[in-house]
Interface confidence: low
């Protein structure tokens, strides 16, 4: 049975040309973390495996970077970054959980940086 | 059983340096990422810099180009080398392990940046 629930930051905005931080936290299950995902829309952004360590999308490598954590930094974005992120939790034994996020980058200097790291 | 110590951590002019040291034990630190958060007084607790297997380093925007976060595997220690430190640095310092989430603590060191 899958007990766990996903936080996530939420609906996050930010500046054009500024960095962003993404971050997803799995909680009220004992499963083991094997793999997470991070994803917009259909694109693999990053990949975080317990084994392997982090892999980038070569097409995003200049713009993103691991962490803090689990999450993902979104870096130099755009306005065409706005969209929604998903991370993808694979764990074991429950399966999958998936948080959504959504990001709107904004042309002015009024975006709220809503993305600070929270402690559980 | 995990620990994680911090020390180094004390009185510093504004400009100054301080190196924290945060030595784990219990687990199998050369597989681990590590990072470093703060808290500041009434404020809450905020993260710093880590540091991944791989030697993936990065940090926050407020510490970029000042701290630098490092992991000695021979010594299962991970470093902060704080330069240029400003009064707002002042906080209690926490490393912690970073697994599914920063499941372990250690107990913070406090850092004080005043002339």
């Known amino acids: 049975m899958m007990t766990g629930t996903i936080e996530t930051t939420g609906n996050i905005s930010a500046e054009k040309g500024g960095s962003i931080i993404l971050q997803c936290h799995l909680s009220s299950t004992t499963a083991q973390v094997t793999q997470v995902n991070w994803e917009q829309q259909d694109q693999l952004l990053a990949i975080c495996n317990a084994d392997l360590g982090w892999h980038i999308s070569p097409s995003f490598k200049d713009r993103v970077a691991p962490g803090p954590g689990l999450g993902l930094t979104l870096q130099s974005l755009t306005v065409n970054d706005t969209g929604e992120y998903f991370c993808i939790y694979h764990t074991y034994p429950d399966g999958t959980y998936t948080g959504r996020i959504f990001l709107e980058v904004l042309e002015s200097s009024v975006a709220e940086h809503g993305a600070r790291f929270q402690i559980p | 059983e995990v620990q994680l110590v911090e020390s180094g951590g004390g009185l510093v002019q504004p400009g100054g340096s301080l190196r924290l040291s945060c030595a784990a034990s219990?687990?199998?630190?050369?597989?681990?990422?590590m990072g470093w958060f703060r808290q500041a007084p009434g404020k809450e607790r905020e993260w710093v810099a880590s540091?991944?297997?791989?030697?993936?380093?990065w940090y926050a925007d407020s510490v970029k180009g000042r701290f630098t976060i490092s992991a000695d595997n021979s010594k299962n220690t991970a470093y902060l080398q704080m330069n240029s430190l400003k009064p707002e640095d002042t906080a209690v310092y926490y490393c912690?392990?970073?697994?599914?989430?920063?499941?372990?603590w250690g107990q913070g060191t406090l850092v004080t940046v005043s002339s």
């Open positions: 219990g687990f199998d630190f050369s597989v681990s990422w």
């Open positions: 540091v991944l297997r791989g030697g993936y380093t």
């Open positions: 912690a392990r970073e697994g599914s989430w920063f499941d372990y």
